[in-house]
Structure formats: C-alpha cells, structure tokens
C-alpha cells in the first residue's frame, strides 16, 4: 500500500532518507528531486550533495541532519498545498547501476484552526529537535542513532513506516541505515 508523509500548511515537512558511509567522510552523492524518481539521475532537482558538501539547494529545501553521517533526510520549510506530491531521494552509489532510489509521497493538509494550543499530532511535530537549526554544514542538531544494518528494501519500508507521529515518537532515537561498502 502507498505510504504517505503528512504535514500541515505553514509547518515544516520532513522526508526521511539515510545511508551509512563506508568510512567517515567517504560520502556518496545524493540528490532530491520533485516528482517520481526517473530511471537515471534526478529530475527537477531541489537539493544535491557531492562527496564533500551540499553543492546545490533551492529556497525552503535543506538538510537538517548530519549528512556527513549519511542522514540526507529532506526538510521543506513552511509548506503550502503546492508542495504535495512525490519526492525522490536518490543515493548515487558508485559503480555500475548501483543507485538506490526512493519515492516518498508528501501530503499537505490545510492548517487546523483550533481555539487553544494543543499538542500537534502530525509527522513533522514528532521531530522537533531535527527542525530547529538551519544550515548546510555539520548539523548542530542531534543526529539519529543506528539500527542494526538492514537491506535496502527494508530501509525503504522502515522509512515509510515513520509516517505517523506515534511511530515517529517511538523511533525518534533510532534510524534506519544503509551501509555502503
């Protein structure tokens, strides 16, 4: 069944994507694109990393985790209804046809009108510590820990299961990882 990630208009949305570098600082290029992953490359690129740094990003799209440790999860700032749709995380693993690609479906809901502040129950609110610092250098926020190594199908599935705040709260101190190399 299709998995959805949800956020409300005006909030930040979070789309998880992780890998484990083969060695510290031995990074793999990653691109994020709007729209389903094409078979080659990324289309409609909103953010791209190379072997060392974030080398391209567009307004409102950024990485808040420590991408040098393989947390390449995408944050979209101050979302609108137009941000709904499929996003592609492509991990460009070196070698012939080794790329791993994941489609993540983002659904933006109209903002709730509530008379008094209540605890938010959407996906983004489950990750407040990951949404507090903007920057493209080493993340100033605490990074996710690691679960035991799992295969790429499992990471996609596990990442998909982070879609509601209950699961997100349960898993907020863990993270699915892909080990490269």
């Amino acid at each position: 069944s299709e998995v959805e990630y949800r956020a409300e208009v005006g909030q930040n949305a979070y789309l998880p994507c992780f890998y484990t570098p083969a060695a510290p600082g031995n990074l793999v290029p990653v691109c994020w694109g709007k729209g389903a992953c094409p078979v080659f490359e990324c289309g409609n690129v909103v953010l791209r990393t190379d072997e060392r740094d974030v080398n391209y990003w567009t307004s409102r799209y950024w990485l808040n985790g420590d991408f040098r440790k393989g947390d390449v999860s995408l944050t979209i700032e101050n979302v609108t209804l137009a941000d709904s749709g499929i996003y592609c995380c492509r991990i460009q693993i070196p070698g012939i046809m080794n790329d791993e690609k994941f489609n993540l479906k983002l659904v933006i809901k109209p903002a709730k009108v509530t008379p008094a502040p209540t605890r938010q129950r959407d996906f983004t609110a489950a990750f407040p510590r990951m949404l507090t610092t903007r920057g493209h250098g080493p993340a100033e926020t605490q990074t996710l820990g690691s679960l035991p190594d799992i295969n790429l199908t499992q990471i996609s599935t596990l990442a998909n299961e982070l879609r509601d705040s209950r699961l997100a709260n349960d898993l907020r101190d863990s993270g699915a990882t892909i080990r490269i190399g």
Epitope: V39, G43, F102, K105
Partner: antibody, heavy 119, light 112 residues
Framework: QVQLKESGPGLVQSSQTLSLTCTVS????????VGWIRQPPGKGLEWIAI???????YYNSALRARLNINRDTSKSQVFLEVNSLHTEDTATYFC?????????????WGQGLMVTVSS | DVVLTQTPSTLSAIIGQSVSISCRSS???????????LYWYLQRPGQSPQLLIY???NLGSGVPNRFSGSGSGTDFTLKISGVEPEDLGVYHC?????????FGSGTKLEIK
C-alpha cells in the same frame, strides 16, 4: 525545436568497430541525457546505453564489454562505439532523449540509422 | 533482466473499434510509493517510436485521449477507444525501473 540525428556507416564488417554519432539540437546535453536503442529487422527494441545529463554512463549488461559511450557537449554530440561486431548487431540504431523526469523518458527520437554487419 | 511479454503479437481492427493490448512483466514494476514504471510507445510504419503512456496510466504530451493505460505490479493494458487510421503500427511496452531497460516484443496493429 528538439531534434536528434544519427550518423555513421551503413555497412560494417564483422569483428570491426561501429562508431555512431548522435547530433542534437534544441536542447543541451548538460540538461538532458541521450541514449541509444536498436531494432534488428522485423524485431523488437533493445536498449543499449545512455549518457546522462550529469555525465554518468549506463550500459546494457549483455553488451557492456563491447560498448563505449561518450559525448562532446560543445558540439552537442553523443558517440557510441560497438566493437567486435557480429552479424546479429545488424539493426536500425536510434538515439533518443531522456528528459530526466518520468514523463520525458525517451520523449524524442532520431530517425534511426540502418547498420548492416556483413560477414 | 526483466522480461516483458506482450499479447497479442498482431491485432486487426476496424476503424472505430476499441482494442486492448496486454503487457506482462516477470517482475513487479511498482515501488513502495505506488509508482509504476511501465511505458507504452507507438512506432508507426517507417518511423521512430513515440511516447504514448508513462507510469502505466499517464498520457504523454500531445497524445489523444482515446489512448489509456492501466495496471500495476506485473499486469498492464493499453486500450485504444475507437481506433483511427493513424493508430496503425507497432506498440511497444517498456519497463523503466530496472536497468537494463527492457521492451516487450511488440504488438502490430493492422487496420482491416
């Protein structure tokens, strides 16, 4: 407008190397990928290789050992070499554009070039 | 490699008739987000192929809406609702999720 055109020899001897050129206009090779697909007479299509917009290369594993693809972005040309030719390599060779989105995969094609490999 | 099996290999239709072509894959062409990487191309006689349908059910640019695609997983169908004379040619399905990309053997549509 977008155009792709294949050029190269129409007849090649077996065991020789086939060198094909795809010259494109109406778009930049740094924004779009260009792939090669062939069609033996009366048969179906077979994907050969692609040079992506970012310069990455992907090959059909069944042909990989005999293939080389590269490009000259300044001349808007993509080149395909097929070596150690067999008569089964006789086909119409198409170059085609990959727009790097799912809705533009092979959205424009060249007219095709018929290549005969003789023994 | 992914094997795509197209049926029938040849199809005869009269103008205005509705026809369907089947494409079956040896592996699933859908991912966990429900995206299905199946494409349909039409190759008219003596011409290059042209994109008809992408992602199983989306109409390519400038393609008449008498063409429609459906299916997910491993079973797919292309339907032409009311065949026109310009529809004759060979229809190819292609999968775009696994490298190498592979095509079906083609279905030739003839006009009676």
């Amino acid at each position: 407008q977008v155009q792709l055109k294949e050029s190269g020899p129409g007849l090649v001897q077996s065991s020789q190397t086939l060198s094909l050129t795809c010259t494109v206009s109406g778009f930049s090779l740094t924004n779009y990928g260009v792939g090669w697909i062939r069609q033996p007479p009366g048969k179906g299509l077979e994907w050969i290789a692609i040079m992506t917009s970012g310069g990455s290369t992907y090959y059909n594993s069944a042909l990989r050992a005999r293939l080389n693809i590269n490009r000259d972005t300044s001349k808007s040309q993509v080149f395909l070499e097929v070596n150690s030719l067999h008569t089964e390599d006789t086909a119409t060779y198409f170059c085609t554009r990959d727009g790097t989105t799912v809705e533009t995969l092979f959205d424009y094609w060249g007219q095709g070039l018929m290549v005969t490999v003789s023994s | 490699d992914v094997v795509l099996t197209q049926t029938p290999s040849t199809l005869s239709a009269i103008i205005g008739q509705s026809v369907s072509i089947s494409c079956r894959s040896s592996q699933s062409l859908s991912d966990s987000a429900g995206i299905t990487y199946l494409y349909w191309y039409l190759q008219r006689p003596g011409q290059s192929p042209q994109l008809l349908i992408y992602l199983a059910s989306n109409l390519g640019s400038g393609v008449p809406n008498r063409f429609s695609g459906s299916g997910s997983g491993t079973d797919f169908t292309l339907k032409i609702s009311g065949v026109e004379p310009e529809d004759l040619g060979v229809y190819h399905c292609m999968q775009g999720i696994h490298v190498p990309l592979t095509f079906g053997s083609g279905t030739k549509l003839e006009i009676k």
